[in-house]
Amino acid sequence: TQHGIRLPLRSGLGGAPLGLRLPRETDEEPEEPGRRGSFVEMVDNLRGKSGQGYYVEMTVGSPPQTLNILVDTGSSNFAVGAAPHPFLHRYYQRQLSSTYRDLRKGVYVPYTQGKWEGELGTDLVSIPHGPNVTVRANIAAITESDKFFINGSNWEGILGLAYAEIARPDDSLEPFFDSLVKQTHVPNLFSLQLCGAGFPLNQSEVLASVGGSMIIGGIDHSLYTGSLWYTPIRREWYYEVIIVRVEINGQDLKMDCKEYNYDKSIVDSGTTNLRLPKKVFEAAVKSIKAASSTEKFPDGFWLGEQLVCWQAGTTPWNIFPVISLYLMGEVTNQSFRITILPQQYLRPVEDVATSQDDCYKFAISQSSTGTVMGAVIMEGFYVVFDRARKRIGFAVSACHVHDEFRTAAVEGPFVTLDMEDCGYNIPQTDESTLMT
């Protein structure tokens, strides 16, 4: 994926077995053919937390080799460590798989900082806490990398869930989810519930923690409250959407809405922060600073570098504003808004002060590649990637962190005119030069 500070996200998680929750009581009215309302076997199949990424257990090859794989809606390659590396506890051993097929083709993926490269092949892949299917999928076997795998993390690969257009080396390499849908009866849809902890977890707590759910092929009604609101996928490459208005504590930023989507706006589970274009970031921070002016914080905090600590349990959530993003709706001239709390955009950080303190980093940052709705946004919501109907749904997550005074929200409809004008059209010549 193209963002310099984006991937990989530190996982730092141990390998305790995934625990399935007891089945929930749900209203199981089907939304569409093949979409039941409860997917008990997939609930809680993710581990991780904001700032460290979320991973799912997958198996590759015959006999199956189990690996933890980072779930990334901001890229489109299924790539796994396939050679010894000091930071990997395990890796994909192609020579031990009777079903591995070499594609005799290499792949090289540079990032602004770091890179990975490897060899393309196919093999049988399944998701133990997913649909009961096995698919033959393209796999990039990572043989060399720099600043990709991270010491102390517990994942060995990445599952790019976006579209073929941004796959490497080119769009002819079918992404995993496309292969899954083609080869099985799994509906062309998945949904993510990422559950931020809201407080720093030490290693032993993380081992016992639950990160969230990736529901493959459907929607689980127990994972959200209220209604799902859908925004069109503008173009099938990244999961690109259009933001039409931004408010801080109900105050409109009053910018030309094109600025919000310059040069695009995407939903990306592989990014920690809410990343905003430079002008938008500056306006948003100015507004957040003004709203929280009873306390002052150093510039390094607003840059996402310094941590601010409060006595445990005394974080002044009330002085920080809510942030609302208005998204283009499915109906002409109609939008809806998603609202996040400081509990989402102040990211808890562990091991820096004493146990008597709660410390946080500001998790909104500047971007030169458009708006990125990363984990900071996604942890407030249950997000439905409805590829079949080219739309993304948002509902308030049943696991989002809030307080007794405020909660994340998804609300609508609102009348918004000329929303199509909010989209930025990337010049064709620029697209191929984007630094990955």
Partner: antibody, heavy 120, light 108 residues
């Protein structure tokens, strides 16, 4: 130019409350550019941060002293104060007041310090 | 908790010599580190902030370097008034709370 001056009793009995005041002269304590803080230094030892205050009254304290320490501000008198309760001999130190500048990050201006001895 | 370890505890040098003081953080503090000078009976004085920026009025013979966990204060040529105790302080975790134990620069 801006100056800071600590004042208060030099001797406090064990179990009593230590009270010090820092008077800011040459500029307003209500400047939005600064926090104000207290640091102490036991004889022959290193520096220990006690806490900070913003003119609005927002405070931050050293976890090791929480429950005993209170810092307050009086903008009308251009002063901020330190109270440390239930003192023991271990609280004997030179107490400094200081300005937290450079974007609220660094103690860039200090008072001369005042020695407080805890003894009966 | 981030711990700052200064070394050496004492540095014995002659005027005109170069002094190199070290401050090591138990985990990365980026460039959010300051150096202070304290002479006997006086309050500390800010020398360096953000690891390498000289505070107002500080002579050019004082310089700071480093980032992450390892930092250095260098006095290129010691003047008689430079013999003092030097402290580092991290402000990566805010509010600034952690000082190093100090390095005493004494006349040889």
């Amino acid at each position: 130019q801006l100056q800071l001056q600590e004042s208060g009793p030099g001797l406090v009995k064990p179990s009593e409350t230590l009270s010090l005041t820092c008077t800011v002269s040459g500029g307003p304590i209500s400047s939005s550019s600064y926090y104000w803080g207290w640091i102490r230094q036991p004889p022959g030892k290193g520096l220990e941060w006690i806490g900070n205050i913003y003119y609005s009254g927002s405070t931050y304290y050293n976890p090791s002293l929480r429950g005993r320490v209170t810092i307050s501000v009086d903008t009308s008198k251009n002063q901020f104060s330190l109270k440390l309760s239930s003192v023991t001999a271990a609280d004997t130190a030179v107490y400094y007041c200081a300005r937290l500048g450079h974007g609220y990050n660094y103690f860039d201006l200090w008072g001369r310090g005042t020695l407080v001895t805890v003894s009966s | 908790e981030i711990v700052l370890t200064q070394s050496p505890a004492t540095l014995s040098l002659s005027p005109g010599e170069r002094a190199t003081l070290s401050c090591r953080a138990s985990q990365s503090v980026s460039s959010y580190l300051a150096w202070f000078q304290q002479k006997p009976g006086q309050a500390p004085r800010l020398l360096i902030y953000d690891a390498s920026n000289r505070a107002t009025g500080i002579p050019a013979r004082f310089s700071g370097s480093g980032s992450g966990t390892d930092f250095t204060l260098t006095i290129s040529s010691l003047e008689p008034e430079d013999f003092a105790v030097y402290y580092c302080q991290q402000v990566y975790v805010w509010p600034p709370r952690t000082f190093g134990g100090g390095t005493k620069v004494e006349i040889k």
